[in-house]
């Protein structure tokens, strides 16, 4: 799947993780589309 | 080590398409996004996007989403981008960065030159 | 999308000076800020991550502070190899973001 980004913002959340993807593990199931 | 190794520098006419490639070693390739970074002569840094080598998820910067293709070789550890319609001002050095979730961009490629020119 | 703007652009110094960079970044970005070094012609380098944490290598006379929307880079002691562009670069969104650079000069 692809993204564009720069037109939204997670800046406001709550949580104290960073809202970049986390790093790729085999697990990973593809996003549908 | 961790190493980003680049193609060579490319000369493009205007209109015409880049690739660049960047083949990792040191490090499991499908561990880490893969992003690309470009710097024009004498400006700072303007990110373009990134590939999950896995599942080929990409994050695009806007100003790009409509000429870059990220594409990603797990058999040879190699990540690509692919810019089209290159115009002068595309004019820039080139870079691919290992982005660590936590660490952000914590190994660069050295750099690919690509010079747009009639 | 968050704008991160540097000050100074500029700053002329000499070896031995302690110098700060600041980075103010237009809405909060938690910790996730970090520091590149570039020297000319080469790649930019990984000094500072997460607003303080020193990247693996990286000599502790730099030092990175700050949180929410107001970050600093400090060297507590200039080098003759410390002089040249550093750039602040948010890690906490997307899209990823770059100040547009500081350039350390030799005074």
């Known amino acids: 799947s692809e993204t564009t980004t720069g037109t939204s913002s997670n800046s406001s959340q709550s949580t104290s993780n960073s809202g970049l993807a986390p790093n790729p593990t085999n697990a990973t199931t593809k996003a549908a589309g | 080590q961790v190493q980003l190794v680049q193609s060579g520098a490319e000369v493009k006419k205007p209109g015409a398409s880049v690739k660049v490639s960047c083949k990792a070693s040191?490090?499991?390739?499908?561990?880490?996004?893969m992003n690309w970074v470009r710097q024009a002569p004498g400006q700072g840094l303007e990110w373009m996007g990134e590939i999950n080598p896995i599942t080929s998820d990409k994050y695009f910067n806007q100003k790009f989403k409509s000429r870059v293709t990220m594409t990603r070789d797990t058999s040879i550890s190699t990540a690509y981008m692919e810019l089209s319609r290159l115009r002068s001002d595309d004019t820039a050095v080139y870079y691919c960065?290992?982005?660590?979730?936590?660490?952000?961009?914590?190994?660069w490629g050295q750099g690919t030159t690509v010079t747009v020119s009639s | 999308d968050i704008q991160l703007t540097q000050s100074p652009s500029f700053l002329s110094a000499s070896v031995g000076d302690r110098v700060t960079i600041t980075c103010r970044a237009s809405a909060s970005i938690s910790k996730y800020l970090a520091w590149y070094q570039q020297k000319p012609g080469k790649a930019p380098k990984l000094l500072i991550y997460?607003?303080?944490t020193l990247h693996s290598g990286i000599p502790s006379r730099f030092r990175g502070s700050g949180s929410g929307t107001e970050f600093t880079l400090t060297i507590s002691s200039l080098q003759p190899e410390d002089f040249a562009t550093y750039y602040c670069q948010q890690h906490n969104e997307y899209p990823i973001i770059f100040g547009q650079g500081t350039k350390l000069e030799i005074k």
């Open positions: 960065a290992r982005r660590d979730y936590g660490t952000s961009l914590d190994y």
């Open positions: 997460a607003g303080s």
């Open positions: 040191g490090y499991d390739f499908t561990g880490y996004h």
